[in-house]
């Protein structure tokens, strides 16, 4: 705390503001009749240095001049940038117990002269905005520095505004609050910034600009779109702009896209026709403006207009497949399946599907609409049938897709050869085949069909399928493929009026099964033992089971068990063995094997054959 200098004064030479690296002399003088006692020699003046209110040094040893008991001069050097406080105190040497008394204090500021301001940039936002300029001040001066922005222009006028930088605020931008209007488009303006502080001054180079150089139009507003005759592909984009705008840039994209469609429009006057939109698609539209064809700056992009284009009638054809099942000697059940159109084909919300089953010769027609992607009907087994399906939205229907209903696996000569299924990775399977050897009619296409081998999958789940051109002999299936699940895969070869198929099982990833089959019964028939079992529960199979193994050994024997390996067939749940001795008690069990290995053993059963077994 500095008292109001009642006891004396402190002065600084050359000044209280000095350049970095300079020294200063601080003189502390007592006022007349002030001091410790009537003996001036007992007055000792000391100088203390404070930085950020913390005492950092006693400058007792820096005295360069001393009028004993009356005044002292101290030299201070190596002052750091910023402000340093010096306090002069009076120490009465004959009374050591009393603390020194403050006399007076002074603040010395160390800094640098300002550098010439650089990179002046001026902007006016919109035709009715005001001119604001910013600049780079250069190095920090550590002193209060005043900046004057001067703008000179037509009519011999100069506009100026000031601000200052210190340790609390920075001044590198000023808004002059004056508007430049388009009638001054040809006029030249000159801007400069002057910086001044206690150690010097500097001025920027003059920067010349025109109205067009600095005015950034406001972004367009009130954006809307009008679809001509409710068209889904053609629309007129409309917006409001500032009066002087001559050039617009439009950008638009579907919401899930990553790249914009860009359009430049000259003299659009707030209107532009777009002709390449996708129906029933969420779009984002933005517009930017410019006041001059060659010069000037683009405005910021407008706020986005987000809207969905109207529907148009579906295009493209449905991908149809079917299943046939005989019910009795004169009736069959036809189940039709089809895949949903992708959005670019559906071009709207599909409301329903129109399904037709027609008997070609007798002209019998069954028609129906459904909202589902499958349809089942019972029809006579006689006659040649064809099916067609089309998709409808609010604007119309797609062209019907036709398919001939043939016996899919009825012609052995059309069955593809050497069908194989290899797991590619966790979620797909590569299926390959060779064409039928002796097909008497040309293969029009292959259909690869797959379904998880789980109970009830035929009735519960629709099949998955891929259409393959006749010259391709492989398919990578991935839709709904999960690891550790076995799929039945069929490859159909279809001609105009016939079908042949081959079947294989495959999985995308496998492990050894969790458990072995459960032996439910052992029966003796005609000198043979029949082992019956229940299959491993579906979740525990963990892939395609290649074969089962039946193990047996004499009870209490330590010898290796004998085994019989059976090719896995889903329909089979019993198997005969005939190498057991009569009236010997055996222990039997089963395991299951996938490509990854063998399961733990299933339950053990004991059995003692009675008859005369071979």
């Amino acid at each position: 705390n500095i008292d109001v200098c009642k006891l004396g004064t402190v002065t600084v030479q050359p000044a209280p503001v000095i350049p970095l690296g300079s020294a200063a002399n601080i003189s502390c003088s007592l006022n007349p009749k002030q001091g410790c006692s009537h003996y001036p020699s007992s007055n000792e003046l000391i100088l203390l240095k404070f930085v950020n209110d913390v005492l950092v040094e006693n400058l007792h040893g820096k005295k360069v001049h001393d009028h004993t008991g009356h005044s002292s001069t101290f030299q201070v050097t190596n002052l750091s940038l910023g402000m340093t406080l010096f306090v002069c105190k009076l120490n009465c040497s004959n009374s050591q117990k009393k603390p020194p008394v403050p006399v007076c204090g002074v603040e010395i500021s160390v800094g640098v002269a300002p550098e010439p301001p650089q990179n002046i940039s001026c902007v006016q936002e919109g035709e009715n905005g005001t001119v604001a300029c910013s600049w780079n001040s250069g190095k920090v001066t550590y002193l209060k520095t005043n900046y004057t922005l001067q703008l000179s222009g037509p009519n011999n006028l100069t506009c100026q505004k000031q601000c200052f930088s210190d340790n609390r605020q920075n001044c590198n931008r000023l808004d002059l609050g004056i508007n430049l209007s388009p009638d001054l488009a040809e006029s030249r303006f000159i801007v400069r910034v002057t910086a001044i502080n206690d150690l010097g001054n500097s001025s920027s180079l003059p920067h010349t600009f025109t109205f067009l150089d600095i005015v950034i139009p406001l972004p367009p507003w009130d954006i809307r779109i009008n679809f001509l005759n409710a068209s889904g592909s053609r629309g007129t984009l409309q917006w409001e702009d500032e009066g002087q705008v001559v050039l617009n840039q439009l950008r638009y994209q579907p919401l899930n896209s990553t790249s914009w469609n860009m359009v430049n429009a000259t003299n659009a006057k707030g209107k532009y026709d777009l002709r390449d939109l996708r129906p029933f698609t969420e779009y984002e539209f933005q517009i930017s403006s410019k006041l001059h064809l060659s010069g000037g700056s683009w405005s910021n992009w407008s706020e986005s207009l987000r809207t969905r284009t109207p529907e148009e009638e579906p295009v493209g054809i449905l991908d149809i497949w079917y299943m046939k099942q005989d019910i009795d000697y004169d009736r069959q059940q036809i189940s039709l399946f089809w895949k949903s159109l992708n959005p670019s084909e559906a071009r709207g919300k599909i409301l329903h599907y129109q399904v037709t089953l027609q008997e070609v010769t007798k002209k019998t027609t069954l028609q129906n609409t459904t909202r589902h992607t499958s349809w089942t009907r019972v029809i006579p087994r006689t006659g040649a049938w064809t099916a067609s399906v089309s998709a409808a939205n609010s604007k119309g229907a797609s062209a019907p897709t036709h398919i001939n209903i043939v016996d899919l696996c009825g012609t052995g000569l059309l069955a593809p050869h050497q069908v194989s299924a290899k797991s590619e990775n966790m979620d797909n399977i590569l299926v390959t085949w060779q064409p039928p050897k002796k097909a008497d009619s040309a293969v029009r296409e292959y259909i690869v069909e797959w379904r998880a081998l789980q109970p009830g999958s035929i009735t519960k789940f629709p099949p998955h399928w891929l259409r393959i051109p006749p010259d391709n002999m492989s398919a990578l299936i991935s839709e709904n493929i999960k690891p550790y699940i076995c799929y039945e895969i069929r490859v159909h070869a279809l001609s105009e009026s016939q079908g042949g198929c081959s079947s294989i099982r495959g999985d995308s990833k496998h492990k050894a099964p969790v458990s072995g089959p459960h032996i439910t019964a052992i029966t003796e028939k005609k000198e043979r033992l029949f082992i019956s079992w229940t299959h491993i529960p579906f979740p525990e199979q963990r892939g395609c089971i290649l074969h089962y193994r039946i193990y047996w050994k004499e009870r209490d024997s330590t010898a290796q068990p004998e085994l019989c390996e059976i090719q896995y067939r889903r329909s089979q749940n019993s198997h005969p063995i005939s190498s057991l001795q009569p009236r010997v008690t055996y222990v039997l069990w089963m395991t299951a094997v996938t490509a990854a290995g063998e399961s733990p053993q299933g339950n053990e059963r004991e059995f003692c054959p009675q008859g005369k077994a071979n």
Epitope: L157, K161, Q162, D175, G177, I178, N179, L180, S181
Partner: nanobody, 123 residues
Framework: QVQLQESGGGLVQAGGSLSLSCAAS????????MGWYRQAPGKQRELVAA???????IYHDSVKGRFTISRDNADSTVWLQMNSLKPDDTAVYYC?????????????????WGKGTQVTVSS
């Protein structure tokens, strides 16, 4: 409506000083720009100096460094301190004001005007 009342004109010798004052009344709180124009006989009216409520000052190049404009935003008063006066500065000085300003409007298109006060500088 805005009324502008000037005062402080008069006769002064070359090299002397004068201070003009202008007080606005009415809807004066809306005035962003206030300033001084002058018109000498047979000449067009020209802006001498103007100031906005944000502190931006505008000077005609012929008076720069000699005249200083200042303002009290609170009571809508503007002053023009004229030093080192020259015979060429002889004119009727008008106080003017506007809600907002463009460079083009500075040429003489302000919305509100005072009646004027005569300044004569003798040689």
């Amino acid at each position: 409506q805005v009324q502008l009342q000037e005062s402080g004109g008069g006769l002064v010798q070359a090299g002397g000083s004068l201070s003009l004052s202008c007080a606005a009344s009415g809807s004066a709180f809306r005035l962003n720009f206030m300033g001084w124009y002058r018109q000498a006989p047979g000449k067009q009216r020209e802006l001498v100096a103007a100031i906005n409520s944000g502190g931006t000052e505008i000077y005609h190049d012929s008076v720069k460094g000699r005249f200083t404009i200042s303002r009290d935003n609170a009571d809508s008063t503007v002053w023009l301190q004229m030093n080192s006066l020259k015979p060429d500065d002889t004119a009727v000085y008008y106080c003017a004001a506007d809600r907002g300003i463009s460079w083009s409007k500075l040429a003489g298109g302000m919305d509100y005007w005072g009646k004027g006060t005569q300044v004569t500088v003798s040689s």
